[in-house]
Each structure stands twice: as structure tokens, then as C-alpha cells.
Amino acid sequence: SAGAGSHCQKTSLRVNFEDIGWDSWIIAPKEYEAYECKGGCFFPLADDVTPTKHAIVQTLVHLKFPTKVGKACCVPTKLSPISVLYKDDMGVPTLKYHYEGMSVAECGCR
Amino acid sequence: SAGAGSHCQKTSLRVNFEDIGWDSWIIAPKEYEAYECKGGCFFPLADDVTPTKHAIVQTLVHLKFPTKVGKACCVPTKLSPISVLYKDDMGVPTLKYHYEGMSVAECGCR
């Protein structure tokens, strides 16, 4: 799995809704693949981490003043939806086909 | 200044183009306010850090399994342009009025 020593990438993160207390309203799925963005944003920032100009600047400043300025951070830059079956306010099971922003599609350095 | 113990916020970061080697092509300004996103993304994530659903989920999983999953990260969520005067290949000064993504407008937890 990607640690701090490896470069920014998408890694598996299985989330169980019971673990986070969301099983009280999400009926299904019981768990899903959320993914996680892990790893460092090291100089030089590669194209695959789609760095913004600010991330490039911050990386260069970090090189020069590592104690003063942090590195850019490996974060989700694009998210995907999942489908969930949930209980509405009246306890009626309802399907949300497109529950936005739940799973990582892409990671990058920001 | 915002450290890891404080919550995610925008802090000052004056960038000198000479420090990062960009003075070879940027004539002016000599330095600019880039800002930096600093601080932690702690539970519960406040509205002002505009968390995505994935950031909320990751924060909850981190609470449950702090050694397995990292916290969400404080990063620029909106960037602003600056104007730069640069030297072209012939050494002629030319203005880029809207040089995108150079300065942080907003920080958030992602």
C-alpha cells in the first residue's frame, strides 16, 4: 500500500457504513469502495498528479524552505458517485442512484 | 500562523520568484502573495472548510481507525490569478493579465 515514501496515488479504502454510524440510515450497500489518496507530492511533480500552478510553486518553495512551507498534499481531485438505498424521514426505503462525491476517481497534488 | 494544531485556514505565503528560479522569465512582480493552506481537518468538519462527502467519510473512518486511514487534507479549493510580466524567447516583455491558479482564494478539507 502507498505510504508517505511513495508518490501520490489512489489506494483502496473499503468503508463499512456500520463503522461510521451511517448504517442507521443507509440500508445498502453495507460497505463500499471509497478509495483514499495516499503518498507524497515530491519534486518534480509529475503530470499524472495534475498539479496546479500553486502546487508547483509551493513545492519549489518547500524545496528552498522545507521547515517554513509544507509540501503540496495528495488529495482527491475528482470524485465519483455511488448508488445507495436509504431510509427517508418516514423510514421508507428510497434509492439514490447518484449519491455524489463518495468515491475517489482521481488523486492529485494540491 | 496556523500550525498542525489549528484548524484548516488560509495563511500568508510571500513567494519570491528568485527563490524558486522563476526570475529567469518573470520580470515582475519580484514577489507575490501565494497564500498557503495550513492546519488540520479535525472532526467534526466545519462548513467553512466545505468538505466533500468523501472527506466527511474519510474523517469518520480516521476517527475509528486512526493508524489505518489518514485525516482529510487542508488544501486550496479555489485559486486566483495574478498578472505577470514575462520575457519571451526574444527577451521582449509581455503581460499575462490572467495567469491562472497562482494564489489561494479558499482553503478546504479534501
Epitope: - | 502573495e33 490569478p81 498578472s83 510580466l85 524567447d89 521582449v92 509581455t94 503581460l95
Partner: antibody
């Protein structure tokens, strides 16, 4: 020596069209972001729009009063900038300058009148 | 009404010092990016300076400063050939391009 020379101005009726050109020399045209700025008679300067270099995406941006009516394009092989003006209005009457921000042409007068 | 406010006119006698102000009245304009143009009668505008860059051929009698939400152009040792219009210009983030002040007509008296 940097030179920007505009042409194509003239008298046109409201609703008509006109295409302005700006011939450039003395700098690396393909790298430059180029703008059109206009000045109505006796008035101040007003930004019309800008085109980025191809390496920066070649995208265009326009001021609200001209959006949807004016189109900026460039031909890097000819070192020429263009401004296609459609659905012209009397309030478009002005001297039109092309500029790199640092250098400006002498301008070309566009008069929209019936 | 321009979001950069200049006085419509200014005047002085030869040898005097004249200051022209430019006030930012919109949060989309960053005072850091304000610069100045000179337009002499019947001529195209000419860049006076941008940040601390002064194009070759521009007299060092012209200088600029910024404070709070205002920028100023100072001309020392006023000369008759300085007569004309002076425009401040800034970067309008919302408009994605430069915005110009209304212009100040400088008259050299006597």
C-alpha cells in the same frame, strides 16, 4: 523593434460585421497573450477580450458587452491577430487597439452608424 | 462606473510634483496587480510601469505606490510633454481580464 499594426476598420451599419487584423513583429508572437482594447470617442479605455497562446490553451475571454458577438482568433504562422465583430451596435464605435499589455498598436477606427 | 476610481483631472505647473490616485472599489480587483498607462494626445496608450518594472524609455520621474485599497502615480519635475491622460489598470478576477480606471486628464499649467 516591436510593432503592432491594426487594419480593417471603417464605417459599417448597425447589425453589420467587420473583421479587424493586427500584424505583429519584433517578438515571439506564438508565446504572447494578446488583447483587443477599445476607446470610444472622447472616452476611456475598455478591454474587449483576449486570446492566450496555444501553449497556454489558446482560450479566449471576452468583456460582457461583446460576448457572443465578437470572436478573437490568431494565426501564429502569419503573426496575425484577428477580431471578428458581428451584430455591430452604435455603441461599438471606437478606436480598436491590439496589445500585448506592454506594447500597443496605433489603433484602427470602427464607426457604426446608419 | 469603473471599479477603479480616478479623479477626472489633475494639474500642476512645470517642475511641480503631481499625484494621481486610483481607488479600488471592488473585491474582485487585487491592488497588487494595479499598474499604469499614459496616453499622450493622439497617441496609443503606453505602459508606464508594472509593479517595479519600468519599460525602457519611461522617465524615472514617474513612480507608483500602493496602500490599502488605493494606488498612486507620482510625477516629479512636471514637464509640458507629460500632458495627457493617465489610466490605472487592474486584474478583474470575475471578468477574466484587465479593467481600466476612468482616466485622469493631466494639464500642465502656464
Amino acid at each position: 523593434e516591436v510593432q503592432l499594426v491594426e487594419s480593417g476598420g471603417g464605417l459599417v451599419k448597425p447589425g453589420g460585421s467587420l473583421r479587424l487584423s493586427c500584424a505583429a513583429s519584433g517578438f515571439t508572437f506564438s508565446n504572447a497573450w494578446l488583447s483587443w482594447v477599445r476607446q470610444a470617442p472622447g472616452k476611456g479605455l475598455e478591454w474587449v477580450g483576449r486570446i492566450k497562446s496555444k501553449t497556454d490553451g489558446g482560450t479566449t475571454d471576452y468583456a460582457a458587452p461583446v460576448k457572443g458577438r465578437f470572436t478573437i482568433s490568431r494565426d501564429d504562422s502569419k503573426n496575425t491577430l484577428y477580431l471578428q465583430m458581428n451584430s455591430l451596435k452604435t455603441e461599438d464605435t471606437a478606436v480598436y487597439y491590439c496589445t500585448t499589455g506592454t506594447y500597443w498598436g496605433q489603433g484602427t477606427l470602427v464607426t457604426v452608424s446608419s | 462606473q469603473s471599479v477603479l476610481t480616478q479623479p477626472p483631472s489633475a494639474s500642476g505647473t512645470p517642475g511641480q510634483r503631481v499625484t494621481i490616485s486610483c481607488s479600488v472599489t471592488n473585491s474582485d480587483i487585487d491592488i497588487d496587480n494595479v499598474h499604469w498607462y499614459q496616453q499622450l494626445p493622439g497617441m496609443a496608450p503606453k505602459l508606464l510601469f508594472f509593479h517595479d518594472y519600468r519599460p525602457s524609455g519611461v522617465s524615472d520621474r514617474f513612480s507608483g505606490s500602493k496602500s490599502g485599497t488605493s494606488a498612486s502615480l507620482a510625477i516629479v519635475g512636471l514637464q509640458s510633454e507629460d500632458e495627457g491622460y493617465y489610466y490605472c489598470a487592474g486584474l478583474d478576477v470575475a471578468m477574466r481580464g484587465p479593467v481600466f480606471g476612468g482616466g485622469t486628464k493631466l494639464t500642465v499649467l502656464g
